[in-house]
Interface confidence: medium
């Protein structure tokens, strides 16, 4: 049956899926706040452009009866459930905002003729790559694999003079949604990361990880994991670590490293943290005041989703083009729009580009310092601290394979 879009005659709506299962355990009121703040900005921007139109959001809540685990791993049915609701209501907006879980996005994409754009704050997995009408506003796993390969290969920096081609990956299955899919992409045999490495082994047990830290026969000095410092501490504790071990801790959506008076705990000295450069204005905006540092990015992605909708609306209306066309549905990519905290760039496949930041712990100050940045848009690593006060020998990152000489 045909679903009509509330998307013409000066009235434009965005349908926001409010799912109990979301990529981050975020109260739905906070998501609503972000959406409403975004709508206010969009209305102002359209008015300033001389476009006298109405813009609203319709929130679609799942009943949570069948699947109320609040966990993305059980989200497949919930997305379809919401699609059924849209189908029964026979109406939706110009754009669908949500879902954020990889399973539900993938399933919705499989089971529907998406003639309208879908914006997601999440959908991190490789299975959501290269979808023609899907836009992802939080760094997907593909972007992480590109950084890691680029960094592994780099060998011409003052602090990294060896190319790496090996790695352990710690993945125990209890990770958050973002981490689950990031590590999944590193584990997948078909992924870019796997293709480019000569050795890769996934460690699934705590004991396996703990043993590697001092194992003289280890096959790599590099361990990739995902989570926050507390997660690492629970796993590593105060165990001794061989001097040429490098732990890469992926913690993209966590601003805590940049807060004033943060001191890096001693167990972080062998660790490089991969995170994102945080926005400035997020710290005191009304919608993020009650959010923890980890939740800001999720709420911001919703807000930016609304601003993207507004940007595309403005572009099409100014050009006198129809909103309910395949052209509109496929237009949410290969562009830069004015986000809440500055310009937001989407690549050719509608995935957000960002600046990733690799941090190290200064042995002098016990502070996190920026070692380098990585621009996902141009796939380029830029050194920042050219003389880091590392724990590693000679202020250089070690080789990924220890030369043990004749045995």
């Amino acid at each position: 049956s045909q679903v009509s879009q509330n998307c013409h005659n000066g009235s434009y709506e965005i349908s926001v899926l409010m799912m109990d299962n979301s990529a981050f355990a975020e109260p739905l009121e906070n998501v609503e706040d972000a959406v409403n703040e975004g709508l206010e900005i969009v209305r102002g921007r359209l008015q300033n452009a001389g476009l006298n139109v109405t813009v609203n959001a319709s929130f679609m809540y799942s009943d949570g009866l069948i699947h109320n685990s609040g966990d993305c791993r059980s989200s497949t049915c919930e997305g379809l459930d919401l699609l059924r609701k849209i189908s029964n209501a026979k109406r939706m907006g110009c754009v669908l905002m949500g879902p954020s879980c990889t399973y539900s996005t993938f399933q919705m994409y499989l089971d529907t003729e998406l003639s309208y754009p879908m914006i997601s704050a999440g959908s991190f997995g490789l299975s959501c790559d290269y979808k023609e009408t899907l836009t992802r506003l939080m760094s997907p796993a593909r972007k992480l694999t590109y950084f890691l390969v680029n960094f592994w290969k780099t060998n011409d920096l003052p602090f990294k003079t060896y190319s790496w081609s090996t790695s352990y990956v710690y993945k125990n299955g209890t990770e958050s949604e973002d981490c689950f899919w990031y590590l999944n992409a590193l584990e997948a045999s078909v992924s870019y990361f796997s293709h480019e490495l000569s050795f890769k082994l996934v460690l699934r047990q705590d004991k396996e990880f703990q043993d590697i830290l001092m194992d003289h026969n280890r096959k790599s000095n590099v361990i990739v994991m995902c989570g926050d410092p507390e997660f690492l501490y629970k796993l590593k504790g105060d165990r001794a670590v061989a001097e040429d071990i490098v732990i890469i801790l992926v913690d993209l959506f966590n601003d805590q490293y940049f807060e004033d008076n943060v001191t890096a705990p001693d167990y972080m000295k062998n660790v490089l943290v991969l995170t994102r450069s945080p926005g400035n204005s997020l710290l005191n905006s009304s919608f993020s005041r009650n959010l923890s540092p980890t939740k800001r990015d999720f709420a911001l992605a919703y807000l930016n989703g609304i601003l993207l909708f507004g940007h595309m609306l403005k572009t099409f209306l100014e050009n006198g083009e129809n909103i309910t066309t395949p052209k509109f549905a496929h237009a949410f990519r290969n562009l830069t729009f004015e986000g809440y905290d500055g310009p937001v760039t989407l690549d050719d496949w509608g995935d957000v580009d960002s600046t990733m930041v690799l941090l190290y712990t200064s042995v002098d100050t016990k502070k996190y310092k920026v070692l380098l940045t990585y621009d996902t848009h141009v796939n380029q690593t830029n050194p920042v601290d050219m003389s880091p006060t590392f724990t590693w020998k000679n202020s250089k990152l070690p080789n990924d394979i220890t030369d043990r000489g004749p045995q």
Epitope: P158, F159, F258, S277, P278, N280, G342, T355, V357, T365, K367, K369, V370, L371, T373, N382, V384, D385, M386, S387, P388, N394, S395, K396
Partner: antibody, heavy 122, light 110 residues
């Protein structure tokens, strides 16, 4: 006070090499980097590269790789820059400067040497 | 490389007036809320002297007549009021990526 004393003017033939020095005093030499900057008459400033005496690590502008080699002697608190295969394009004033880092991790230049004039002529 | 474009290339000011020099970067030079742009003054026959670091922080010993502002890609050095001693070439420098200087702005007195 913090000072960077550079060696005297150099006159060299095309194809030759010169080694300029920059002696630091008034601060802990190994706690900072030393950067080198070129200024040609009627032109602006061009960044050549940096050396971090504590580790001996160097960082070059691609344009000067193969042209300039940076070294440092911790015992005498002196940084050196050797320029080789000189041409008339290398005639310029060369400055050394102290590179200071911040919590963000970037480096900028707070104290400068007096400059060394290099003239390449046959 | 990041290109820094300074304008104007030269500036003739009356004593006591306000001089503003612009430095525009070809891409953002901000990192974690910090603007990695620095301003230098070079007088004839002298080495450059640091005036302002990180866009707006006045270096110790530099007169308060000098101030800096801006963020991301657009930065301004302001001298107010201009004095005789300010005749020099002013350069901006970015330390966000491989270091680059602006082309310089020559300040003269009318």
């Amino acid at each position: 006070q913090v000072q960077l004393q550079q060696s005297g003017a150099e006159l060299a033939r095309p194809g030759a090499s010169v080694k300029l020095s920059c002696k630091a005093s008034g601060y802990t030499f190994t706690s900072y980097g030393i950067t080198w900057v070129k200024r040609r008459t009627g032109q602006g400033l061009g960044w050549i590269g940096e050396i971090y005496p504590r580790s001996g690590n160097t960082y070059y502008n691609e344009k000067f790789k193969g042209k300039a080699t940076l070294t440092a002697d911790k015992s005498s608190s002196t940084a050196y820059m050797e320029l080789r295969s000189l041409t008339s394009e290398d005639s310029a004033v060369y400055f050394c400067a102290r590179a200071i880092t911040t919590v963000v991790g970037d480096w900028y230049f707070d104290v400068w040497g007096t400059g060394t004039t290099v003239t390449v002529s046959s | 490389d990041i290109v820094l474009t300074q304008s104007p290339a030269s500036l003739a000011m009356s004593l006591g007036k306000r001089a503003t020099i612009s430095c525009r970067a070809s891409e953002s030079v901000s990192l974690i809320g910090t603007n990695l742009i620095h301003w230098y003054q070079q007088k004839p026959g002298q080495p450059p002297k640091l005036l302002i670091h990180h866009a707006s922080n006045l270096e110790a010993g530099v007169p308060a007549r000098f101030s800096g502002s801006g963020s991301r890609t657009d930065f301004t050095l302001t001298i107010d009021p201009v004095e005789e001693d300010d005749v020099a070439i002013y350069y901006c420098l970015q330390s966000r990526k491989i270091r680059t200087f602006g082309g310089g702005t020559k300040l003269e007195i009318k």
